[in-house]
């Protein structure tokens, strides 16, 4: 997150981290039920660990943390690398969470976000594209949902109904390492961090997010059948 601020501890209890090896964060994730996470489809890796209930970027033990393995990764069938459409994936964890003030699921929004809606994006991603600086703790940033027209003008020919743009003034954006993390609007999960320009946080180049209202049925059906 570029130019965000430290999240309040336990204010984003649905925020997850996907880790490679002992503690190599490569993507965010969102807890949507006691045993299921959502993340971006482009975050798919054969082996990874899941960390929930953690505030710090470092591997230091925190009393609220819970660690899991992913036992099933189910990318949306419409996702195809290197495209960005349908950029979501369900992860089934090896066990259910222990519900606590640090670890709680978030409800997915059934209605699509409208222009001007204020939302919160969060993650442990880099705070600067050019220098790969990482934050000490989870970062939060208020962003505004942009109109479809403005979104399409920012990225001609690259935006479809499975995406929405959100941002603020130049210099504030999600960034590398935030992928798959939550965009929460009015207390409901509206989107996942997906893509944007490189470097992040450029004028008229907003972040692009997976538009989860388009996938509520697929998410429910997939969870029920697995």
């Amino acid at each position: 997150i570029v130019n965000g601020s430290d999240c309040q501890k336990d204010a984003q209890p649905w925020q997850g981290a996907l880790l490679l090896g002992p503690n190599k964060l490569y993507c965010g994730a969102v807890l949507i039920s006691p045993q299921w996470l959502l993340t971006a489809a482009h975050c798919r890796k054969p082996v990874f660990r899941i960390r929930l209930g953690h505030h710090s970027m470092s591997p230091v033990y925190e009393s609220g943390q819970q660690m899991f393995q992913g036992i099933k990764s189910i990318p949306h069938p419409g996702y195809s690398h290197p495209g960005h459409s349908n950029d979501l994936m369900l992860i089934k964890m090896n066990r259910k969470i222990r519900d606590s003030h640090s670890v709680k699921p978030v409800e997915i929004a059934c209605d699509c976000a409208t222009e001007g809606t204020r939302c919160m994006v969060s993650g442990w991603g880099t705070t600067s594209s050019s220098h790969n600086n990482f934050p000490k703790v989870l970062q939060c940033l208020n962003i505004t949902v942009l109109s479809e027209e403005r979104c399409k003008n920012s990225y001609p020919g690259q935006i479809d109904k499975t995406m929405f743009c959100a941002g603020d003034e130049e210099g504030r954006d999600s960034c590398q390492g935030d992928s798959g993390g939550p965009v929460v609007c009015n207390g409901k999960l509206q989107g996942l961090v997906s893509w944007g320009d490189f470097p992040c946080a450029q004028r008229n180049r907003p972040g692009v997010y997976t538009n989860l209202c388009e996938f509520v049925k697929w998410i429910k059906d997939t969870m029920n059948s697995n």
Epitope: P82, S130, G177, S179
Partner: antibody
């Protein structure tokens, strides 16, 4: 199987410019960056810069800033490296190489290596 | 810029030997390190990416390890075709930089 095919050897005078091309055959640049790396005779590898063809965004090593221009034409899947104000120390083999752009435009944080390389183009600078 | 220091600069070894090459970054680069093999007159070939992931088609006698600033490339049992020069490269941040290379020669 994607191959990167580079233009032929060049002999140039000091002070002039050279433009080397790199064409992807059997595939496209979609989802990749293209780096340029040079190797002077008997020396190691030196990264010059790269381009993300999808956006045209380029990044250069400070040493070459102002002298090198990297461009790409997505429609022909060809990247170009132009080096100006040539001097004898620029005599080298110039390689283009492909790297996955994952972790750049998408907002994951993962870095791949350069998995496909061109055959190299020898540039000789001599008066 | 991040400096990459490789050691040794050359090593003499025999077929069947275990060879270890080290690479040190001047600052932390997480696991974003690649290893390449280069033979005379040829382009480099990617062996390892993300410090320890074996590139498709590369023999399993090659392995990589390390994180942060210190990294290692190991050839578990040297084969005749492995005599070459090996380079590490950080791909953590621009400008990408290479180590000076390690030449593996026949003893």
């Amino acid at each position: 199987q994607v191959q990167l095919v580079q233009s032929g050897a060049e002999v140039k005078k000091p002070g002039s410019s050279v433009k080397v091309s790199c064409k992807a055959s059997g595939g496209t640049f979609s989802g990749y960056s293209i780096s340029w790396v040079r190797q002077a005779p008997g020396q190691g590898l030196e990264w010059m810069g790269l381009i993300f063809p999808i956006s045209g965004t380029a990044n250069y090593a400070q040493k070459f800033q102002g002298r090198v221009t990297i461009t790409a034409d997505e429609s022909t899947s060809t990247a170009y490296m132009e080096l100006s104000s040539l001097r004898s120390e620029d005599t080298a083999v110039y390689y283009c190489a492909r790297q996955s752009a994952s972790g750049y435009y998408d907002r994951s944080y993962y870095r791949y290596g350069m998995d496909v390389w061109g055959q190299g183009t020898t540039v000789t600078v001599s008066s | 810029d991040i400096q990459m220091t490789q050691s040794p600069s050359s090593v003499s070894a025999s077929v069947g030997d275990r060879v270890t090459i080290t690479c040190r970054a001047s600052q932390g680069i997480s696991s974003w390190l690649a290893w390449y093999q280069q033979k005379p007159g040829k382009a480099p070939k990617l062996l390892i990416y993300a410090a320890s992931s074996l590139q498709s088609g590369v023999p399993s006698r090659f392995s990589g390890s390390g994180s942060g600033t210190d990294f290692t490339l190991t050839i578990s049992s040297l084969q005749p075709e492995d005599f070459a020069t090996y380079y590490c490269q950080q791909v953590s941040s621009f400008p990408y930089t290479f180590g000076g290379g390690t030449k593996v020669e026949i003893k």
